[in-house]
């Protein structure tokens, strides 16, 4: 069976450049090791934003210098992307891979359009 991945269609980042969304997958296998990758698609170019591999039942751990953080609960991953600016507006795709044990399964979400609006600079006060 194919692995279905669901994510929200649209998310608006906060004024501090933080966007959060849930990535949920329907697992066809009994995986113990899962990889979640956030990809950004813009102008037909795909780049990796962040990735984390976690053991089922354990916390999601991104690299120290990652702009992503997250938590997992069952087949649901709560993702937060920080440090976003207006130029980072785009389609963010959640890719879920059941890595171990084999067989490998791949599921790709339809993407979440994240809108980022840079805050207006505060006027100087005398």
């Amino acid at each position: 069976k194919a692995m279905h991945v669901a994510q929200p269609a649209v998310v608006l980042a906060s004024s501090r450049g933080i966007a959060s969304f849930v990535c949920e997958y329907a697992s066809p296998g009994k995986a113990t090791e899962v990889r979640v990758t956030v990809l950004r698609q813009a102008d037909s170019q795909v780049t990796e934003v962040c990735a984390a591999t976690y053991m089922m039942g354990n916390e999601l751990t991104f690299l120290d210098d990652s702009i992503c953080t997250g938590t997992s609960s069952g087949n649901q991953v709560n993702l937060t992307i920080q440090g976003l600016r207006a130029m980072d507006t785009g389609l963010y795709i959640c890719k879920v891979e059941l890595m171990y044990p084999p067989p490998y399964y791949l599921g790709i979400g339809n993407g979440t359009q994240i809108y980022v609006i840079d805050p207006e600079p505060c006027p100087d006060s005398d």
Partner: antibody, heavy 119, light 107 residues
Framework: EVQLVESGGGLVQPGGSLRLSCAAS????????IHWVRQAPGKGLEWVAA????????YYADSVKGRFTISADTSKNTAYLQMNSLRAEDTAVYYC????????????WGQGTLVTVSS | DIQMTQSPSSLSASVGDRVTITCRAS??????VAWYQQKPGKAPKLLIY???SLYSGVPSRFSGSRSGTDFTLTISSLQPEDFATYYC?????????FGQGTKVEIK
Amino acid sequence: EVQLVESGGGLVQPGGSLRLSCAASGFTFSGYWIHWVRQAPGKGLEWVAAITSRDSYTYYADSVKGRFTISADTSKNTAYLQMNSLRAEDTAVYYCARGSYLGSAFDYWGQGTLVTVSS
Amino acid sequence: DIQMTQSPSSLSASVGDRVTITCRASQSVSSAVAWYQQKPGKAPKLLIYSASSLYSGVPSRFSGSRSGTDFTLTISSLQPEDFATYYCQQSSTTPFTFGQGTKVEIK
């Protein structure tokens, strides 16, 4: 420029061994999958094995499981396919290919190296 | 294992023709289906990834679509350089599998 170059092919007797190499350049090796795909003379494409170079998860086709071993040396940007207990039906051109981020399609391929298993 | 049944196995067409090649997956797969073009003695080249996304540098006359477990590659107006063999491939689960190929020949 992304490049994949295979080497190590040749003529080997049934039951023999061979190690193929796939030297990669032009991209950060550790972020991608590397696959081996083969094509017997006049036949179609057959996926053989894959490795995630970042953390070395490995996967194999049933036809080679237990006989072939895929590995990667990220310091050398090179993937390997160790082929043991070779059979006549393993005769093929072996390609290495890079798996792309999205959809895991094979976006770059090497030129291929011919492996002939014959007595 | 997921079988990718490709049809037709070969076809004859003329320059300017619209050509359609179909791949049917034996079971439900994700959108991780790709299409490749291969010419004799050469490595395959990626045309379409994720069922319908055109790979960078590939002419827009190539397109891909999906309907359930059926995946289609369309060449809207066949050009002389398009005569080759085309393969579909799924990366939804291991073992990754290819279709048996469709040879597009000159009529």
